[in-house]
């Protein structure tokens, strides 16, 4: 099997308050089976931003149709950016486990920062 890699191409993403930010994440393999989640920050206090498996995330949409069985693009868009959204965002692959899924691999992260306001 090809070893799964999580690719987040942008190290830094400059965003504008009120606009929509796109955070890119692709995987190189569909295996092992399990969901991809997005977090802001690391460690026990990290904030869940999006879970493809369940939950309601009104400001988040996916770039691709995650119901495609061969989908490898887990990029997301976050609308109506505010200063509170700054931070480093990680896409994280989990493998299935019982009773809980197990973190398998994380992307390197994309730092979201505020850019200069348009003049």
């Amino acid at each position: 099997e090809e070893e799964l890699q999580m690719i987040q191409p942008e190290k830094l993403l400059l965003v504008t308050v009120g606009k929509t930010a796109t955070l890119h994440c692709t995987v190189t393999s569909l295996l092992p089976v399990g969901p991809v989640l997005w977090f802001r920050g690391v460690g026990p206090g990290r904030e869940l931003i999006y879970n493809q498996k369940e939950g309601h995330f009104p400001r988040v949409t996916t770039v691709s149709d995650l119901t495609k069985r061969n989908n490898m693009d887990f990029s997301i868009r976050i609308s109506s950016i505010t200063p509170a959204d700054v931070g480093t965002y990680y896409c994280v692959k989990f493998r299935k486990g019982s009773p809980e899924n197990v973190e398998f691999k994380s992307g390197p992260g994309t730092e979201m920062a505020l850019g200069a306001k348009p003049s």
Epitope: L30, T67, R69, K96
Partner: antibody, heavy 118, light 108 residues
Amino acid sequence: DVQLVESGGGVVRPGESLRLSCAASGFTFSSNAMSWVRQAPGKGLEWLAGISAGGSDTYYPASVKGRFTISRDNSKNTLYLQMNTLTAEDTAVYYCARETWNHLFDYWGLGTLVTVSS
Amino acid sequence: SYELTQPPSVSVSPGQTARITCSGGDYYSTYYAWYQQKPGQAPVTVIHSDDKRPSDIPERFSGSSSGTTVTLTISGVQAEDEADYYCGGYDGRTYINTFGGGTKLTVL
């Protein structure tokens, strides 16, 4: 409540075609992948086809690929199964099912009976 | 592709524990579910994602997995649990859904 209601079944002759429909309600149809599953009399379940939420991607087992076609109309909240060149072996109850995020099934319709007989 | 193998029948007395096994597939690439079907009715999903129980399914139904075998456990079996039970799998390697042959659960 999630509701899936199949229609279009009936008696057809060998070699004929038939199109089944599945009307969905109680959930955001355009956000869910869907599948068709059938059950021949006294037999087990057989997966026939799956389709992504947007309808662009379809999936089939080798047993029906090229003969059955799954499609959907999200504006009508309806799933379809076009079946061509039917044979007696296609006699079964046909169910539509909603897929979970990982392509298992969480809700099923009541089924529609297709009988292929001369 | 892969095959899922179940015992054709399982018998249990009311109040006892029934276990139905399903083998095949690959833990690395396959998710499993269990579907209950009573005579003349449509299937009902009792377990999905190996061990997740839908909110409207009684707590006596549980799922577990070990290697290439998954198990449906019904604790304190009731007469109304008599039905056919199918395991189903989705293989992320082939994008294919598969069903086991079904197990007839008889409540004595």
